[in-house]
Amino acid sequence: AILGRSETQECIFYNANWERDRTNRTGVEPCYGDKDKRRHCFATWKNISGSIEIVKQGCWLDDINCYDRTDCIEKKDSPEVYFCCCEGNMCNERFSYFPEMEVTQPTSNPVTPKPP
């Protein structure tokens, strides 16, 4: 491991379309990729009238947008589908929305997902 960096070897896995995609619904996903490239975890979700619906969680390939992020936080303002990525095992277990334009309180509390 590189000093000061948490390597990602596994992530929380969830797939809302597990039947269509013929995958597991929930679990832990081991992360594979080129040995010299970084690996991350991600979460995607929708906000349907204030209710959080997880779309997918899993491993994410080397992405500078995710470097050194220990927390999974979406910063884009009002996306159609929320996306966040992070580094460290299972770092996508919790995810949050803190739009970058906001300098005061976040518009939503951190989410600890409980898949339906």
Epitope: F42, G58, W60, L61, V81
Partner: antibody, heavy 115, light 111 residues
């Protein structure tokens, strides 16, 4: 092994649209971006845009804004690039590439725009 | 985002070293370690050689190396071989909040 297989060559009339596909295999499609790049005959590489394959979020080069649409179908692990209002200058080989580093490329699709 | 600037051509004899430069600005090349280098042989798709300024892609010979100084990234090929004759492009990471851009390409001729 990772593979990106693109659709075949197309000949189009000026003013029409073209839709090029890029089918991914050998990795989890929803674990990265797909980028689209074009190369006109004898010219350099030109970045067109990118899609986050899991969220569907897109970014486009300013030059192509309003004329290009990139989509992804996660059920078939396929990305699409549609370019509208074609003109002769759009004659080029169009490539898809995986991830932000463009570490794997499709074989390219020649699109010829001619009346 | 403006295109990155590369020399149109460079040449060298077998066994020699050549360096290809890629100049950007303080807001792209200068401030981020996200420049990549691609090799393209005629009629073929580009191939990633170096990513993140200096990381060699898996399977790429260690004759290829990347570096950066200020707003200029460089690709150095040492111990030049005939099969290194190709076009070389620098480019940036693209995805999320980052927009892609390529240099104009450099034709490397092995004399």
């Amino acid at each position: 092994q990772v593979q990106l297989v693109q659709s075949g060559a197309e000949v189009k009339k000026p003013g029409s649209s073209v839709k090029v596909s890029c089918k991914a295999s050998g990795y989890t499609f929803t674990s990265s971006y797909i980028n689209w790049v074009r190369q006109a005959p004898g010219q350099g590489l030109e970045w067109m845009g990118t899609i986050n394959a899991v969220s569907g979020s897109t970014s486009y080069a300013q030059k192509f804004q309003g004329r290009v649409t990139i989509t992804a179908d996660t059920s078939t692990s396929t990305a699409y690039m549609e370019l509208s209002s074609l003109r002769s200058e759009d004659t080029a080989v169009y490539y898809c590439a995986r991830g932000g580093w463009f570490d794997y490329w499709g074989q390219g699709t020649l699109v010829t725009v001619s009346s | 985002q403006s295109a990155l600037t590369q020399p149109r051509s460079v040449s060298g004899s077998p066994g020699q070293s050549v360096t290809i430069s890629c100049t950007g600005t303080s807001s792209d090349v200068g401030s981020k370690n996200y420049v990549n280098w691609y090799q393209q042989h005629p009629g073929k798709a580009p191939k990633l050689m170096i990513y993140g300024v200096s990381k060699r892609e898996s399977g790429v010979p260690d004759r290829f190396s990347g570096s950066k100084s200020g707003n200029t990234a460089s690709l150095t090929i040492s111990g030049l071989q005939a099969e290194d004759e190709a076009d070389y492009y620098c480019g940036t990471f693209a995805g999320g909040k980052y927009y892609g851009v390529f240099g104009g390409g450099t034709k490397l001729t092995v004399l």
